[in-house]
Interface confidence: medium
């Protein structure tokens, strides 16, 4: 039996100390927030250029329009993350050409192609949840058998432990039972 540290739940991706869940179903922006909250996460709030590059790549590779936790719902033209933090000046460069354009009440931000776009919040899109990776103290180490020893940091998408499995199942259950048109 190996003692392994798995910082992220099954089906989640590890990057720079955080875990990310890229949905396989679609929800509107508000329901995407709820989906993330239900698994102890948050609709993704981007904190660095490296994180943005990583997430943009995931989104563009899969060719999906994907919600992030950014909107100007509180005040038109003032973009704010779901954690209450403002959009930093350097992040404005991620908007696609001519965006945000607020055509027809477009108040929520999505990954679109190589940058960001604003779109109507009631549209169903894929979403990304983010939460801190497990610290992997001795009490949190999981027993998995058999398994090879993993290098540090563990590979993306690795996971382990009953809590992780339940969380992954919870996401899967919601994805199969919530249909938004």
């Amino acid at each position: 039996t190996e003692r392994l540290c798995h910082p992220c739940p099954w089906e989640w991706t590890f990057f720079q100390g955080n875990c990310y869940f890229m949905s396989n179903s679609q929800r509107n922006w508000h329901d995407s927030i709820t989906a993330c909250k239900e698994v102890g996460a948050q609709l993704v709030v981007i904190k660095s250029a490296e994180e943005q590059n990583f997430l943009q790549l995931q989104s563009s590779r899969s060719n999906r329009f994907t919600w992030m936790g950014l909107s100007d719902l509180n005040q038109e033209g003032t973009w704010q993350w779901v954690d209450g933090s403002p959009l930093l000046p350097s992040f404005k460069q991620y908007w696609n050409r001519g965006e945000p354009n607020n055509v027809g009440e477009e108040d929520c931000a999505e990954f679109s192609g190589n940058g960001w776009n604003d779109d109507k919040c009631n549209l169903a899109k894929f979403w990304i949840c983010k939460k801190s990776a497990a610290s992997c103290s001795r009490d949190e180490e999981q027993f998995l058998s058999p398994a090879p020893a993993t290098p540090n940091p563990p590979p993306a998408g690795s996971g382990g432990g009953l809590n992780d499995i339940f969380e992954a199942q919870k996401i899967e259950w919601h994805e199969h039972h919530h249909h938004h048109h």
Epitope: A49, E50, G77, P89, S90, K92, Q93, Y94
Partner: antibody, heavy 122, light 106 residues
Framework: QVTLRESGPALVKPTQTLTLTCTFS??????????VSWIRQPPGKALEWLAL???????YYSTSLKTRLTISKDTSKNQVVLTMTNMDPVDTATYYC??????????????WGRGTLVTVSS | DIQLTQSPSTLSASVGDRVTITCRAS??????LAWYQQKPGKAPKLLIY???SLESGVPSRFTGSGSGTEFTLTISSLQPDDFATYYC????????FGQGTKVEIK
């Protein structure tokens, strides 16, 4: 054709307020992603970014000079104005305005004015 | 604030030489870096943006590379028109310039 042109006094006295105007053509500061910035260069020295104003009227200032600077825009006139208070001889420099393009490749400066030399002396 | 340090400050080279200028950032700026060329009495001219993207109309002998904290501008074969001062500029967090590298005739 896109152009930017700086205008303002060539000479100001110490403690006075400097007002510079950037008049541009070929683009609109109401277009998403477009910004106009002020950058200066003392004689024989490096470039120093001063201030930037976005299409949505967000304003950003150099941390070391923010108490002295004010940037504003008049979209209808295609102008951006910079005021700098309490001028000192060390503020003698060529002052440039420059444009930040629209798009998701970053907020660099793709087009510059020719610059205007401002001398601070009594 | 993010500081940019260019090296060398001055570079003596001949026509046809391969020239490399380095720019180091005080913290990671991903690939949000631009390079400019400036000639005496003239405004800076954009050469490279996003660390390695060549601005339209700029000769292909200019190439940019790097990410994170270390970046380079390379001129593959120096031409008479290339003797100038070169500046790097970051736009990851506000905007700052390097102190410049003067490329002069050897």
């Amino acid at each position: 054709q896109v152009t930017l042109r700086e205008s303002g006094p060539a000479l100001v006295k110490p403690t006075q307020t400097l007002t510079l105007t950037c008049t541009f053509s070929g683009f609109s500061l109401s277009t998403s992603g477009i910004s106009v910035s002020w950058i200066r260069q003392p004689p024989g020295k490096a470039l120093e970014w001063l201030a930037l104003i976005d299409w949505d009227d967000d304003k950003y200032y150099s941390t070391s000079l923010k108490t002295r600077l004010t940037i504003s825009k008049d979209t209808s006139k295609n102008q951006v104005v910079l005021t700098m208070t309490n001028m000192d001889p060390v503020d003698t420099a060529t002052y440039y305005c420059a444009r930040t393009p629209s798009g998701s490749y970053g907020r660099y400066f793709d087009l510059w004015g020719r610059g205007t030399l401002v001398t601070v002396s009594s | 604030d993010i500081q940019l340090t260019q090296s060398p400050s001055t570079l003596s080279a001949s026509v046809g030489d391969r020239v490399t200028i380095t720019c180091r950032a005080s913290q990671s700026i991903s690939n949000w870096l631009a390079w400019y060329q400036q000639k005496p009495g003239k405004a800076p001219k954009l050469l490279i943006y996003k660390a390695s993207s060549l601005e339209s109309g700029v000769p292909s002998r200019f190439t940019g590379s790097g990410s994170g904290t270390e970046f380079t501008l390379t001129i593959s074969s120096l031409q008479p028109d290339d003797f100038a001062t070169y500046y790097c500029q970051q736009y990851n967090s506000y905007w700052t310039f390097g102190q410049g590298t003067k490329v002069e005739i050897k």
